[in-house]
């Protein structure tokens, strides 16, 4: 029986699968906030081998509303049949199911990064995990956006090999004594909607000429 009817939202769940710091994180939200489970259990199987409905060990009887599936969901070619059960004590309050295709449903959260401003360039240090599984690379491109005085420039650095370890990119040929803001995000080849990081801004220090001009006054 399909319970996807739009007007029936009582205890239904909203699921989201995200690649966060190159870990597959499934999160969920209950539409009816009057139902408060004491704990959840997450189960899944793959559509091509449905017999084995498996409880996710670190998401059995959990009080969290998310689950790290990095070590469970490895294939971008499989459909994952997912079941979330909500409990109050020993009573099963609800069962929500959803089918996921990682290649289609995954959203890519931006990596952590820091910026350091110099007179005419900015060092952008992007933090990737030290080891990233091959399956979780997803044909992603790193995009660094530079914004200043209403002008946005996109930089697509070429990363040799895997996106792993720390990566530094230099945005050069900048104007001293100017405010620049930087955002980073991961872009997928399928033109999915991107999630941009919040902007980080820096006012570049003045250049040598303006410094000497200042000291001459």
């Amino acid at each position: 029986i399909s319970y996807d009817s739009p007007d029936y939202t009582d205890e239904s769940c909203t699921f989201k699968i995200s690649l966060r710091n190159f870990r597959s994180i499934l999160s969920w939200e209950l539409k009816n906030h009057s139902i408060v489970p004491t704990h959840y259990t997450l189960l899944y199987t793959i559509m091509s081998k449905p017999e084995d409905l498996k409880v996710v060990k670190n998401c059995a009887n959990t009080t969290r509303s998310f689950c790290d599936l990095t070590d469970e969901w490895r294939s971008t070619h499989e459909a994952y049949v997912t079941v979330l059960e909500g409990f109050s004590g020993n009573t099963t309050l609800f069962s929500c199911s959803h089918n996921f295709w990682l290649a289609i449903d995954m959203s890519f959260e931006p990596p952590e990064f820091e910026i350091v401003g110099f007179t005419n360039h900015i060092n952008v240090m992007v933090k990737f995990p030290s080891i990233v599984e091959e399956e979780l690379q997803f044909d992603l491109s790193l995009v660094i956006e530079e914004q200043s005085e209403g002008i946005v420039k996109k930089h697509k650095p070429e990363i040799k090999g895997n996106m792993s370890g720390n990566f530094t990119y230099i945005i050069d040929k900048l104007i001293p004594n100017t405010n620049y803001c930087v955002s980073v995000y991961l872009e997928h080849s399928d033109e999915q909607a991107v999630i941009k990081s919040p902007l980080k801004c820096t006012l570049l220090p003045p250049g040598q000429e303006s410094e000497s001009a200042e000291s001459a006054k």
């Epitope: 205890e11 199987t45 609800f94 089918n99």
Partner: nanobody, 122 residues
């Protein structure tokens, strides 16, 4: 609360008809559902299965006599049983699972009801 509640069982003469119902609550998303039965001293036997898209399958001995259907709005699963035979006597159970049909679906279905007794006399 997650529940499957069967009703509609009873006693009937051979050749008669019964309509079983199964009221589902607490399920959200897409589930396939089915009916299986168990007679005293016998193994569980699959009867009929319906996918979330409405496609159906039946055990060979019930094809043409039994019809499975569902009402999505009311969240009720039905089993219309015609031309009943004494060998159809059993407890009939409703089951639900997020997985589409597979060979051992009836044995492995995650959710099941308490059952309703059907007795067919000759």
């Amino acid at each position: 609360q997650v529940q499957l509640q069967e009703s509609g069982g009873g006693s009937v003469q051979a050749g008669g008809s019964l309509r079983l119902s199964c009221a589902a609550s607490g399920f959200y998303g897409t589930y396939s559902m089915g009916w299986f039965r168990q007679a005293p001293g016998k193994e569980r036997e699959g009867v009929a299965h319906i996918e979330s898209d409405g496609s159906t399958r039946y055990a060979d001995s019930m094809k043409g006599r039994f019809t499975v259907s569902k009402d999505n709005a009311k969240k009720i699963l039905y089993l219309q049983m015609n031309s009943l035979k004494p060998e159809d006597t059993a407890v009939y159970y409703c089951a639900a699972d997020p997985r589409p049909y597979f060979r051992t679906w009836y044995e492995r279905a995650r959710y099941g009801g308490q059952g309703t007794q059907v007795t067919v006399s000759s």
